[in-house]
Amino acid sequence: AITEAREEAKPYPLFPGPFPGSLQTDHTPLLSLPHASGYQPALMFSPTQPGRPHTGNVAIPQVTSVESKPLPPLAFKHTVGHIILSEHKGVKFNCSISVPNIYQDTTISWWKDGKELLGAHHAITQFYPDDEVTAIIASFSITSVQRSDNGSYICKMKINNEEIVSDPIYIEVQGLPHFTKQPESMNVTRNTAFNLTCQAVGPPEPVNIFWVQNSSRVNEQPEKSPSVLTVPGLTEMAVFSCEAHNDKGLTVSKGVQINIKAIPSPPTEVSIRNSTAHSILISWVPGFDGYSPFRNCSIQVKEADPLSNGSVMIFNTSALPHLYQIKQLQALANYSIGVSCMNEIGWSAVSPWILASTTEGAPSVAPLNVTVFLNESSDNVDIRWMKPPTKQQDGELVGYRISHVWQSAGISKELLEEVGQNGSRARISVQVHNATCTVRIAAVTRGGVGPFSDPVKIFIPAHGWVDYAPSSTPAPGNADPVLII
């Protein structure tokens, strides 16, 4: 590539008309500088010191009177207009002009496709002074042409703020076809048509395309580039490529794999991240996606207890973030969990079933049928109850917590008692006479304290009253019972 500077469009040339002369082209570079080494300043040979190169503008001796005689129009000599060569060959082309010695401060620059070639890559300007004119030959050489060197080259000379422009020299670098569009890898549905595109350019043109599937040519007759191959459908993975042919030879595109979308593989890992009494947090590593993005996943949960009815709970979730909290589980229960994910084709097989357990929780229900009565002879309150259903204990029962609140005129105090798990009755001492005692009971497991039963109230009279009847847990919707003895 060549360092370039943009220029606004300027009119062509100042001095129109036919100009005699010829331009030499030489495929041997005058100066061999590496193509990639950057651009050297233009090398110029001064008329006064012919053998010694220097850089900068050409200094031409001043003439005191420009009006002393009429000057001929200045123009670059005609040269070859079109050079065709193969990639990596060398090329050298010139433009030449004869400039009367009265002109001063002349500079020649090279331009390609409207952009100045700064640093004048491999450019040499030579001067051949005579009595009245100086012949200037500007040579441009490229040691190993590339496609990027294709284009229209011109010389420009500035004299007294006027610009003289040469005829263009078209450089056409020919080589093997160059792909501008290659087929792309695709994931396709089985037996569904799809298109592949291939485009290549010269020069030289035309470029013809052959398609190749799994190392065998698809089309017997070539198609002009660009070419679109319509594949009616595949049943298994295939590799496609295209061959681009021109007069210089053949270029083969990259081979692209066309995959057939399939159901995904099951997850390769499932992790139990955390368990609570009623939930299990799991994560998973998805398996192979079957060449189609995962859409969502399904977590299947069944009780591992052999006596369970074997029903499966299904929880659907998005494919990301491969994490799900399974809720609404029973406490202290064993579960089998399987994970399956789906893409547009269908569901994967379920992962191998894994085992997970919920932890103990606090009971979810209170003790039932709470009954309270006063035993005046011993000055105690007797409490009886039934333990909550096993299923709703949510763990191994370790005991009960009894709350009893004593209220009399202006005084209220709450006391808590702990009772071992074997009992279903308790006796508490009367704390205050002539007061109301409110009793509530909760079941306790290692997972915590469950809800308290509905309050049962009993009135404790002053000393000497007769023990009359028990108070018990009210039926739903009834007011709290208060037994006054």
């Epitope: 991240r273 089998s336 992962s351 191998p352």
Partner: antibody, heavy 128, light 111 residues
């Protein structure tokens, strides 16, 4: 094609260290757990340890302390670092893909379901 | 540590024979069925034959079958073929333990 290739085996003196590699192709170490298994000459298979897709490692009780499993997912390669080698460590060392793995993060253990793809193995000889 | 015991350790049989190998675990296998069977030929790595006690791995001929649950498992080759002479290993995992245990192996040789 899915493939496992072990390397790094050879003759090593007792007390020495060696690092074995298992180069994986055709699938990703970030999607699969991997395991090392060894087989002494003329003997049965012996499990060494596992590295999960996330990088958690679990080892056989006899291997803890001397053998360390690691991986470089960017290179799709798993390693087995073996220290303080003894004559009884002489064996062919296989790497294998874990077809499915369940991890119990809270309890720091995991269970292999199956080993569904094996490398050809690399021989380690511990001898003076 | 849990142990898997295979029997017999060596088995002589002829082509066409029905062959049965047993694998006994000292405690229940994880999920009662996470037991696999592997085939190994001399100088080669093991190859997965059966997983989940009875599921055939991909590409394994249907003459191989597995059964069992908990602690007792069986591998059966319904009609022994020349390619089946090899050593067979059972392997499995256990709850609460990362160790993956292999049985001692059963060598099936030509009678």
């Amino acid at each position: 094609e899915q493939q496992l290739v072990e390397s790094g085996g050879g003759l090593i003196q007792p007390g020495g260290s060696l690092r074995l590699s298992c180069a994986v192709s055709g699938f990703s170490l970030s999607s699969n757990a991997m395991s090392w298994v060894r087989q002494a000459p003329g003997k049965g298979l012996e499990w060494i340890g596992i590295i999960s897709s996330s990088g958690s490692t679990y080892s056989a009780s006899w291997a803890k302390g001397r053998f360390t499993i690691s991986k470089d997912s960017s290179k799709n390669t798993m390693y087995l670092q073996m220290n303080s080698l003894r004559a009884e460590d002489t064996a062919v060392y296989f790497c294998a893909r874990v077809g499915f793995f369940v991890g119990y993060g809270a309890y720091d253990y995991g269970i292999i379901h199956r080993l569904d793809l094996w490398g050809q193995g690399t021989l380690v000889t511990v001898s003076s | 540590d849990a142990q898997l015991t295979q029997s017999p350790s060596t088995l002589s049989a002829s082509v066409g024979d029905r062959v049965t190998i047993t694998c006994q675990s000292s405690k229940s296998i994880y999920n009662n069925n996470w037991l696999s069977w592997y085939q190994q030929k001399p100088g080669k790595p093991p190859k997965l034959l059966i997983y989940d006690a009875s599921d055939l791995a991909s590409g394994v001929p249907s003459r191989f079958s597995g059964s069992g649950s908990g602690t007792e498992f069986t591998l059966t080759i319904s009609s022994l073929q020349p390619d089946d002479f090899a050593t067979y290993y059972c392997a499995g995992g256990y709850s609460g333990d990362s160790d993956y245990a292999f049985g001692g192996g059963t060598k099936v040789e030509i009678k």
